[in-house]
């Protein structure tokens, strides 16, 4: 069962796996959640009468029974991992810890204006795990305003001590705030020859890449496939690093694949979740349980529902014996990966899906899109919302996109005539406008945040955020879309769709059913040629067919231009303006969301 509560002045006795240092009990809980085996933890706070060298220790624990005896201890804070919980979990920690020195290997020392600048440097440095910044009141004059970038073998501090007039914090790479390049290519027949920092067993190159991304020091990797000539190295995933962050040598070798960590684009790429099934594959590891059940999907569900289970192998029944039930072997290991992989024994293997909730909800696979036709089907565009205005009469005003559990991204021009958020309602999970009745649940709008440089749609900055009055629980019909990664500036999106309930032609009415249209992106140069009297800036993005015929129109404003890349949907544009609707050689103009990622994050993550 999920226990989120922290127990003050309580120590969990026994079950120790390892001890790390964390600046708070909450951070200790997150570290425990991300550790392959940790189910419980005890944190020693600075209020503890214990020797100060024990302050900030985070003791990660495991227990077969998933519980441990509780002992009274002043200053100890204990709790459970979020592994047992269904809510989204993030490794993102934006806190700045005052009068705290988080120790690690300092590898860069430079002067910074403030702690935010220091944190930004850390976030945009591939090696940095955390930083310490000496404030302008630090006693040693020459050390004032010094920003120390640090890393460790584990990604957590080697020690934490109290120190006046310094502040410490973590890299925000896991908050999707890094500007580092995001190299998603997999290089076939390639071995990166740099030294290994670790090696694990993986069934394919994509699992290897996710493991590398999740590892604090892995910057790139090499994976030896099951056809690799040296048997003892088959399915081996070699995690690597280098000072420059790039492989120093690439060697051509068949049956090997190499690639890079996705640490700087991890918000829009599933890095924890390994959802695939591996047929005719047996994962070896420590056996947790053996259960009779029907089918490998049921076996995966069983593994996901069992806190200590990390991976499984399902052995299908022979013929029709045992009522069609096979054996489900629930397994675990010290690092969450199989100790060995065997083929040709008829098993079907896979991983627990409980790690999927550690990925951003926007990366969750949605129902396959229905190709052809204009009308959407339920669950096809779960981020699309309809924004209603209730005064003087209730009607659809604009589209919008869910980007967080309390945030909708839409167009600023939707609010040209809106005086107060009180007259707005957000309906999510809606396919047909006719579904909306008096008693249909909605989200009230607490705040409208319009970009302060917005004047009119045609001059740009046509972007606004709606802060909802209550938080949204994600379901199959309402969940967020990923923002494009700032490190992905070179991505060329091809699979792009515009959706909305807007007019189908210029003189028309709002549609009942959510409409969809696949539309190709148009270069800004081409778009500028079509709109000579306007300035098409890099903060705009255009889409449309040369011959016209498909476009966004009145009522679609604020809605998404959604593009699928690497199996993940990204909010590339916000429907903004255009000359007529679907006119020949008049593409639609959309707000270029990637240019506003900093603005979005600044507004949505303000305290």
């Amino acid at each position: 069962e999920c226990v989120t509560k922290l127990f003050k002045d309580i120590y969990f006795q026994g079950g120790d796996i390892t001890t790390v240092f964390t600046p708070s009990a909450k951070h200790c809980q997150v570290v425990c959640t991300h550790h392959p085996r940790c189910l419980l933890f005890t944190f020693i706070a600075e209020s503890s009468p214990e020797d100060p060298t024990k302050w900030f220790t985070c003791i990660l624990k495991d227990s077969v029974t998933e519980t441990l005896p509780m002992v009274n201890m002043t200053g100890a804070i204990s709790g459970y991992s979020f592994k047992q919980c269904s809510h989204q979990i993030s490794a993102c920690n934006k806190n700045i810890y005052v009068d705290v020195d988080m120790k690690g290997l300092n590898y860069n020392s430079s002067i910074a204006k403030n702690a935010q600048e220091c944190q930004e440097r850390c976030t945009n440095d591939m090696h940095c795990h955390f930083f310490t910044y000496a404030t302008r009141w630090f006693p040693s004059v020459e050390h004032r305003n010094i920003c120390l970038l640090k890393y460790t073998q584990t990604g957590t501090p080697t020690r934490i001590t109290k120190l006046s007039e310094v502040v410490s914090g973590f890299s925000l790479k896991s908050c999707a705030l890094s500007n580092l390049a995001c190299i998603r290519d997999i290089f076939p027949s390639t071995v990166f020859a740099d030294s290994n920092i670790d090696s694990v067993v993986a069934p394919d190159v994509f699992v290897c890449r996710r493991i590398c991304t999740h590892h604090p020091n892995c910057l790139f990797f090499t994976f030896f496939s099951q056809e690799w000539p040296k048997e003892s190295e088959r399915n081996l995933c070699l995690l690597k690093t280098s000072v420059s962050g790039l492989p120093s040598t690439r060697i051509k070798k068949n049956k090997a694949l190499s690639g890079f960590s996705l640490q700087s684009c991890r918000h829009s790429v599933p890095v924890f979740c390994h959802p695939s099934f591996y047929h005719d594959t047996d994962f070896l590891g420590e056996e947790l349980d053996i259960v009779d059940m029907k089918g490998h999907e049921a076996c995966q569900k069983m593994c996901t529902d069992t806190s200590r289970c990390q991976f499984f192998t399902y052995s299908p029944p022979h013929e029709s014996c045992n009522g069609g039930k096979g054996k489900c072997y629930l397994k675990l290991s010290s690092n969450g990966s199989p100790t060995k992989i065997l083929y040709g024994r008829g098993g079907i293997s896979g991983y627990t899906l409980r790690l999927c909730k550690m990925d951003n909800a926007c990366t969750t696979k949605i129902k396959p899109r229905v190709v052809g036709g204009r009308a959407s089907v339920p669950g096809e565009w779960p981020w699309q919302i309809t924004l209603h205005i209730i005064s003087p009469t209730q009607k659809h005003l604009c589209g919008g996109s869910i980007i967080g559990n309390q945030w909708i991204l839409t167009a600023a021009h939707c609010f040209d005539e809106v005086e107060s958020p009180k007259i707005l309602r957000v309906y999510s999970g809606i396919l047909n406008q006719s579904e909306i009745k008096e008693d249909t649940s909605f989200f009230a709008v607490q705040e409208i945040i319009i970009h302060d440089q917005y004047e009119i749609a045609e001059s740009g900055y046509d972007i606004a955020l709606l802060k909802l009055g209550t938080t949204m629980n994600y379901t199959d019909s309402q969940r967020p879309i990923c923002l494009p990664s700032k490190g992905d500036t070179n991505v060329i999106y091809s699979d792009c769709w515009v959706t909305g309930w807007g007019y189908r032609k210029l003189r028309d009415k709002i549609q009942n059913t959510l409409q969809k249209a696949e539309i190709p992106l148009v270069t800004n140069e081409e778009c500028q040629r079509r709109y000579r009297s306007h300035k098409i800036t890099d903060k705009m993005i255009c889409a449309g067919y040369k011959e016209g015929g498909k476009d966004a129109c009145k009522g679609d404003s604020g809605g998404p231009l959604s593009c699928k890349h690497n199996e993940v949907w990204h909010l590339v544009g916000i429907t903004s303006w255009g000359e007529g609707c679907a006119h020949r050689e008049r593409p639609g103009v959309y707000t270029n969301v990637v240019k506003y990622v900093d603005w979005i994050l600044e507004k949505t993550q303000a305290p």
């Epitope: 290997l105 300092n106 590898y107 006693p139 040693s140 050390h143 970038l149 640090k150 120190l163």
Partner: antibody
Framework: QVQLEESGPGLVAPSQSLSITCTVS????????IYWVRQPPGKGLEWLGM???????DYNSALKSRLSISKDNSKSQVFLKMNSLQTDDTARYYC??????????WGQGTTLTVSS | DIVMTQSHKFMSTSVGDRVSITCKAS??????VAWYQQKPGQSPKLLIY???YRNTGVPDRFTGSGSGTDFTFTISSVQAEDLAVYYC?????????FGGGTKLERL
Amino acid sequence: QVQLEESGPGLVAPSQSLSITCTVSGFSLTGYGIYWVRQPPGKGLEWLGMIWGDGRTDYNSALKSRLSISKDNSKSQVFLKMNSLQTDDTARYYCARDYYGSKDYWGQGTTLTVSS
Amino acid sequence: DIVMTQSHKFMSTSVGDRVSITCKASQDVSTAVAWYQQKPGQSPKLLIYLTSYRNTGVPDRFTGSGSGTDFTFTISSVQAEDLAVYYCQQHYKTPYSFGGGTKLERL
């Protein structure tokens, strides 16, 4: 683990120059300042100067004109050069790592004798 | 330049005694003072930095206090292995400087 090791000539004639190397391991010179400190036989510690992680330098005012500190980050080495040596420069020379102005790790030191 | 003065060159003590060594700065150095221990034939060892912060692994019998210009280093209960020379150092402003040292010897 963190280590610092000084290596020097041992004996230098008066008016000659001195060059001592401090080779470090277990940490990066881009992230830490390195100090030079000397101790004449039977006397106290004297601060000579330092080089910061970003390459800036600071020197003891009295010795500034004779001292020069540099480093090679890739080789993990810091260099102390001192010219116009006199007999009162005879001392044990230490390099030490910076921790907010204090020195948390020291080398074993290298003895320099200035004598003809 | 800042001058650090340790008024006692020598101090006599017995095992179990409480002993305090003082250090005076020629100008305000805030709380940027460190204390080192040096035994014969060895390199100095950092005990205290920024007036009162104990370095990793330093026993809690060693403490430091003070601010501005007057600083004190205290050993609450002297052990035989504590007999050594103790130096203060200001790390407020470069050029950093050491005190002349105080030798702690057996009574």
